[in-house]
């Protein structure tokens, strides 16, 4: 039976040229998290952290994103073609998978509002 | 479909190192679900794994091999490496290269091989 | 390590008949990280089955594979002379490191 639930940053605006934080949060499980997929709106993999093996960023994506914090993703050089959703997609044992999303505007203007369910440590 | 194959000297001296290039063809090594790995087979026996490498330079091992094994990528080339150090005859055997879906989760196996190559260690 | 005890050593078949190889692992494997292969004499192996019972691309339907914690099942529902072959189960955790069973050979009678 599948007990936890997936938090993540929601709605997100940042600006061109910026950088952004991707943060899901699974909670109210005991499952161990076996892998983290990053995908964005049109399926394609960002980063795969695999808790044996570590962080693995897609080569379309090396020079951007980098690695974290923790199980999320900071998404770089940020450009209008950005805008749109993002998955987390959490492999666990022996729960099965979790998926969170989360939309992400990229806005021209100098100044973004960046909002966030959360904080973000 | 990618396809893989190998190649290196078929006979290597004891105490030498063991040299093998694997290179792919029909796709990008420079692949992000794949690592990229090598087993071995000695004469009539089984299968042993030795190790594995992502595009990145990202490697596990064998534990049982792993102070003497050392992998290695060449995007540029759509190669990757295996170098064996201290060779003795029981390091005889055929060396595969394969795709490592190790990141596909439900789809864990070595999916694509190349053909082999024998390596003989002898003096 | 996960020791993989592959059982019976040799199988003596006739083409038409059913074959039942089995797989048995020294500790609990992920059904997710169980799979089969086939090899013939001076080729690669082929993968056959991963996810303990997904046939991998270009199976034939006559291959299937069943199981699950320590006990793992490959069935070949009815022998073509092609199947003659030696088969390999194989577990793919990182730690412990991923290993290979002794293999199975498959042989005519």
């Known amino acids: 039976m599948m007990t936890g639930t997936i938090e993540t940053t929601g709605n997100i605006s940042a600006k061109k040229g910026g950088s952004v934080i991707l943060q899901c949060h699974l909670s109210s499980t005991m499952a161990q998290v076996t892998q983290v997929n990053w995908e964005q709106h049109d399926h394609s993999l960002l980063a795969i952290r695999n808790a044996e093996l570590g962080w693995h960023i897609y080569p379309a994506f090396k020079d951007r994103v980098a690695p974290g914090p923790g199980l999320g993703l900071t998404l770089q050089s940020l450009t209008m073609n950005d805008t749109g959703e993002y998955f987390c997609t959490y492999h666990t044992y022996p729960d099965g998978t979790y998926r969170g999303r989360i939309f992400l505007e990229v806005l021209e203007s100098s100044v973004a509002e960046h909002s966030a369910r959360f904080q973000i440590p | 479909q990618v396809q893989l194959q190998e190649s290196g000297p078929g006979l290597v001296k004891p105490s030498q190192t063991l040299s093998l290039t694997c290179t792919a063809s029909g796709g990008s090594i420079e692949s992000g679900l794949y690592y990229w790995g090598w087993i071995r087979q000695p004469p009539g026996k089984g299968l042993e794994w030795i190790g594995s490498?992502?595009?990145?330079?990202?490697?596990y091992y064998n534990p049982s091999l792993k102070s003497r094994v050392t992998i290695s990528v060449d995007t540029s080339k759509n190669q990757f490496s295996l170098k064996l150090s201290s060779v003795t005859a029981a390091d005889t055997a055929v060396y595969y290269c394969a795709r490592d879906g190790v990141l596909a989760l439900n789809k864990r196996s070595f999916d694509i091989w190349g053909q082999g190559t024998m390596v003989t260690v002898s003096s | 390590e996960i020791v993989l005890t592959q059982s019976p050593g040799t199988l003596s078949l006739s083409p038409g008949e059913r074959a039942t190889l089995s797989c048995r692992a020294s500790?609990?494997?992920?059904?997710?990280?169980l799979a089969w292969y086939q090899q013939k004499p001076g080729q690669a192996p082929r993968l056959l089955i991963y996810g303990a019972s997904s046939r991998a691309t270009g199976i034939p339907d006559r291959f299937s594979g069943s199981g699950s914690g320590t006990d793992f099942t490959l069935t070949i529902s009815r022998l073509e002379p092609e199947d003659f072959a030696v088969y390999y189960c194989?577990?793919?955790?990182?730690?412990?490191?991923?290993?290979f069973g002794g293999g199975t050979k498959v042989e005519i009678k």
């Open positions: 194989q577990q793919h955790t990182v730690r412990p490191p991923l290993t």
């Open positions: 490498i992502y595009y990145s330079g990202s490697t």
């Open positions: 500790q609990s494997v992920s059904s997710s990280y």
